[in-house]
């Protein structure tokens, strides 16, 4: 059909991955489909299977090398085409010119540590996973509070517009549990997006002393 | 959105060659998946080739594979169809589409504007 529901989308961790989901309306569920990948400037080929995530989407990882390997560069071009099995051989169903500076979402932050908590306040520090040296300190977070009787959609957004890898939460409620969520995104890229949210991180800020407000 | 002009159709007998232009307006053609459809008259308009945006990449209908070539000239925002072994089957209008701007190419087209159309005639 013209205008189909077909959708080929990618992103690269800046570093040796390129993740990729491939839809399509009307498709067998047990349909054998790969991506491959096809760079303009490097001697390497790889190819990821794609496994089902959903009725119509299938997902796949194309490793390119060691997690922290700097496998592409803003210059590179990776050529990245969907085959499916059909009989005995495979068609090529879509395929993709892919900037990889231009598509980056990076992991999500790792290693989400208190490193103080009082009654009103509590600072979290974390790290980033896999992220390019390229960026040097042009990265930005969103944080969010999950709050008792609330969900993490209600929770307000909390923006860190630099490369800054703590937090100091205000005004919190003594003797409450809490838990915290951050992500991270380059400033580089035009179709660049937001990595997963971090694992939450579980504290409890202290309760307040009796007889003062502390 | 890009305005797509084709030019190039024709009278041609069996056996023979045609290579069809379809000239973009528009400063995303450089990053645009183009395609060419046709459509006979009483069928469905169906998919005949897509190039990546680069150029680097290539789909064809399994009835056109080896016969036609799509290719692009992104300084001069054009694409081209070089129609090779002509059939009275290839008889048709012949389409110029253009894709979501950085998107990929599709079999099942995804497209964002259309060209008016060229007419390809094989006569045996």
């Known amino acids: 059909a013209v205008n189909g529901t077909s959708q080929f989308t990618c992103f690269y961790n800046s570093r040796a991955n390129i993740s990729c989901v491939w839809s399509q309306d009307g498709a067998l569920q047990d349909t054998s489909c790969q991506v491959h990948a096809w760079p303009d400037r490097r001697r390497w080929n790889q190819t990821c299977e794609l496994l089902p995530v959903s009725q119509a989407s299938w997902a796949c990882n194309l490793i390119l090398g060691a997690p922290d390997s700097q496998k592409l560069t803003t210059v590179d071009i990776v050529t990245l085409r969907v085959l499916c099995r059909e009989g005995v051989r495979w068609r090529v169903m879509a395929i993709q010119d892919f900037k990889p500076f231009e598509n980056l979402r990076l992991m999500a932050p790792i290693s989400l540590q208190v490193v103080h908590v009082e009654t009103h306040r509590c600072n979290i520090s974390w790290e980033i996973s896999q992220a390019s040296h390229y960026f040097e300190r042009h990265l930005e977070f969103e944080a969010r509070t999950l709050s008792p009787g609330h969900t993490w959609e209600e929770a307000p957004l909390l923006t860190l517009k630099q490369k800054q890898e703590w937090i100091c939460l205000e005004t919190l409620t003594p003797d409450t549990q809490y838990e915290f969520q951050v992500r991270v995104k380059p400033l580089q890229g035009e179709f660049t997006t937001w990595s997963p949210w971090s694992q939450p991180l579980a504290f409890r800020t202290k309760p307040a002393a009796l007889g003062k407000d502390t | 959105e890009v305005q797509l002009v084709e030019s190039g159709g024709g009278l041609v007998q069996a056996g023979g060659s045609l290579r069809l232009s379809c000239a973009a307006s528009?400063?995303?053609?450089?990053?645009?998946?183009m395609y060419w459809f046709r459509q006979a008259p009483g069928k469905e308009r169906e998919f005949v080739a897509a190039?990546?945006?680069?150029?680097?990449?290539?789909l064809y209908a399994d009835s056109v594979e080896g016969r036609f070539t799509i290719s692009r000239d992104n300084a001069k925002n054009t694409v081209y169809l070089q129609m090779n072994s002509l059939r009275p089957d290839d008889t048709a209008a012949y389409y110029c589409a253009a894709g979501p701007y950085g998107d990929a190419a599709y079999r099942h087209g995804r497209i964002d504007s259309w060209g008016q159309g060229t007419q390809v005639t094989v006569s045996s």
């Open positions: 190039i990546t945006w680069s150029g680097r990449g290539t």
């Open positions: 528009g400063s995303t053609f450089s990053r645009q998946p």
